[in-house]
């Protein structure tokens, strides 16, 4: 807390300058009127304070806006930004993109912050839901945004949303997510046609269920096997050796080099060998001829 | 409910074999969602995987163990059985038999018995 | 072998507090992995499988997240039954364990 004391004579500032850098902490306090500092916040950032004086800066706001800055103000807040607390941003309303832009442009590079990632649900929770244009402006600065959502919060995305989604920005995403993710990305791309709609569609497949693995294996899509590597162990086990072969076309043969990974390994213990030898590509691991292929889980849930 | 329970004898002999014998109730081992496993843990240490058996009798080993690991799989009594062979006292340890499963994760595991390696 | 590097190998905390142990892997593997917790003399539990799904029974206290090859085990509010041992492990390939974290009383 800095004490009031008196601005010295002809140190009243006019205006925010460059002249204020030569200010020692009380003076700026003293002679730097609040009103002033609000209706000029964008001369801030071009001058190089000191990040004590930023404080002072921050103080002389925060007693002027006790419950929260103004939009007009936190537009132009540049650097500041970085001096506020997930509680001082908690306090504000946000509802211009353009604001958002300006204040994720401070961080830029930097990981998320947990004053980012409180602007951000402050801005989202004031929109209703994370419509298209917020989702190209976060997803931009940080491509991992996405997957940094819960299952619930990913609920509010709106199917239309899901085109400005790139697959990079699915990277990190985890099977409860894509779970969510997936119906919303077919409901999206349901209108395109088969190729198109499978290159659309491939980001999302990690949410996707065996019926729709199934109906792809139909349509000569050739998946690659890093798009199958990271399907739902539980959507890849009940497709027949006819099937991953209709689903990989020629890019079945890499099978062979996955065969101790997930989920391939599982897939290849469920399989015939006499199914998986027709293949050619050596693959081991499948049930003998002769062996009963009990699928005993629905009896054990049972019972 | 599952329930694994280990057997087999607390000291073995340097040179010898460890045998040890894991016993399934409350479920069967024929079913295709799970893999039937021996775990490790050397004294105030961590968890080591030494391997696991699949119904059908496919195996898979830890590298640094393979020579010397066998798992099988008695699906009439219900059992899985561990043999390591050439012990040493570093393979004194508890040994843990344990059921994973293939959506999950090691989800049912037995007491654990210790198996003391010594002269 | 796919490597987990665990950290930290120990820690000090309090009853309320929130708890951070991270795990990394060598590779990538998806999301092929699970969390488990320890107490002296008895076999490890399964909490966390999948990175980020809770095993059924387990407190919502406990939760997991992934970041590339990063993966955290995060206790929101540590009780006084929580004080145990931590491990990860990777089931993409071989499976493999983290070396464990002990959390401890402060």
């Known amino acids: 807390e800095v004490e009031k004391t008196a601005c010295p004579s002809g140190k009243k500032a006019r205006e925010i300058d460059e002249s204020l850098i030569f200010y020692k902490k009380w003076e700026l306090e003293a002679c730097v009127d609040a009103a002033l500092l609000a209706t000029q916040m964008d001369r801030v950032n071009a001058i190089p304070f000191t990040y004590e004086q930023l404080d002072v800066l921050k103080h002389k706001l925060d007693e002027l806006y006790p419950q929260g800055y103004p939009e007009s103000v936190i537009q132009h807040l540049g650097y500041l930004f970085l001096k506020m607390s997930p509680e001082d941003i908690r306090k504000w309303n946000v509802t211009s993109l353009e604001t958002l832009k300006a204040l994720l442009e401070v961080n830029k590079g930097h990981e998320m912050s947990p004053q980012v990632a409180t602007l951000i649900d402050r801005f989202v929770k004031g929109r209703g839901q994370l419509d298209k244009d917020t989702l190209d402006t976060l997803t931009a600065f940080y491509p991992g945004y996405l997957c940094s959502l819960s299952p619930e919060e990913l609920s509010s995305v709106p199917p239309s949303s899901i085109w400005a989604v790139r697959p990079q920005d699915l990277d990190t995403c985890d099977p409860r997510q894509l779970d969510v993710l997936y119906p919303k990305a077919r409901l999206a791309f349901q209108n395109m046609n088969g190729s198109e709609y499978f290159v659309k569609i491939q980001s999302f497949l990690g949410g996707a269920p065996t019926e729709d693995l199934k109906a792809l294996s139909q349509q000569n899509v050739s998946m690659d096997l890093a798009t199958f590597m990271k399907l739902r162990t539980d959507a890849v086990l009940p497709l027949t050796v006819a099937e991953v072969q209709k689903l990989l076309g020629p890019h079945v043969e890499g099978l062979k080099a996955e065969e101790r990974h997930r989920p391939v390994r599982d897939w290849i213990l469920r399989q015939r060998q006499d199914d998986l030898d027709t293949l050619g590509l050596g693959l081991q691991g499948g049930i003998p001829n002769g062996y009963l292929v009990l699928d005993l889980s629905m009896q054990e849930a049972l019972s | 409910q599952v329930q694994l329970q280990e057997s087999g004898p607390g000291l073995v002999k340097p040179s010898q074999t460890l045998s040890l014998t894991c016993t399934v109730s409350?479920?069967?081992?024929?079913?295709?969602?799970?893999?039937w496993t021996w775990i490790r843990q050397h004294p105030g240490k961590g968890l080591e995987w030494i391997g696991y058996?699949?119904?059908?009798?496919?195996?898979f080993y830890n590298p640094s163990l393979k020579s010397r690991v066998t798992i099988s799989v008695d699906t009439s009594k219900t059992q899985f059985s561990l043999k390591l062979s050439s012990v040493t006292a570093a393979d004194t340890a508890v040994y843990y038999c344990?059921?994973?499963?293939?959506?999950?994760?090691?989800?049912?595991w037995g007491q654990g018995t210790l198996v003391t390696v010594s002269s | 072998d796919i490597q987990m590097t665990q950290s930290p190998s120990s820690l000090s905390a309090s009853v309320g507090d929130r708890v951070t142990i991270t795990c990394r892997a060598s590779?990538?593997?998806?999301?092929?992995l699970n969390w488990y917790q320890q107490k002296p003399g008895k076999a490890p539990t399964l909490l966390i499988y999948?990175?980020?799904s809770l095993q059924s029974g387990v407190p919502s206290r406990f939760s997991g997240s992934r970041s590339g090859t990063d993966f955290t085990l995060t206790i929101s509010s540590l009780q006084p039954e929580d004080f145990a041992a931590y491990f990860c492990?990777?089931?993409?390939?071989?499976?493999?364990f983290g070396q464990g974290t002990k959390v401890e009383v402060k």
């Open positions: 344990a059921r994973e499963d293939t959506m999950t994760g090691l989800d049912v």
């Open positions: 058996i699949y119904y059908s009798g496919s195996t």
């Open positions: 409350g479920g069967s081992i024929n079913n295709n969602n799970y893999y």
């Open positions: 999948a990175a980020s």
């Open positions: 492990q990777q089931t993409y390939s071989n499976p493999t």
């Open positions: 590779q990538s593997i998806n999301n092929y």
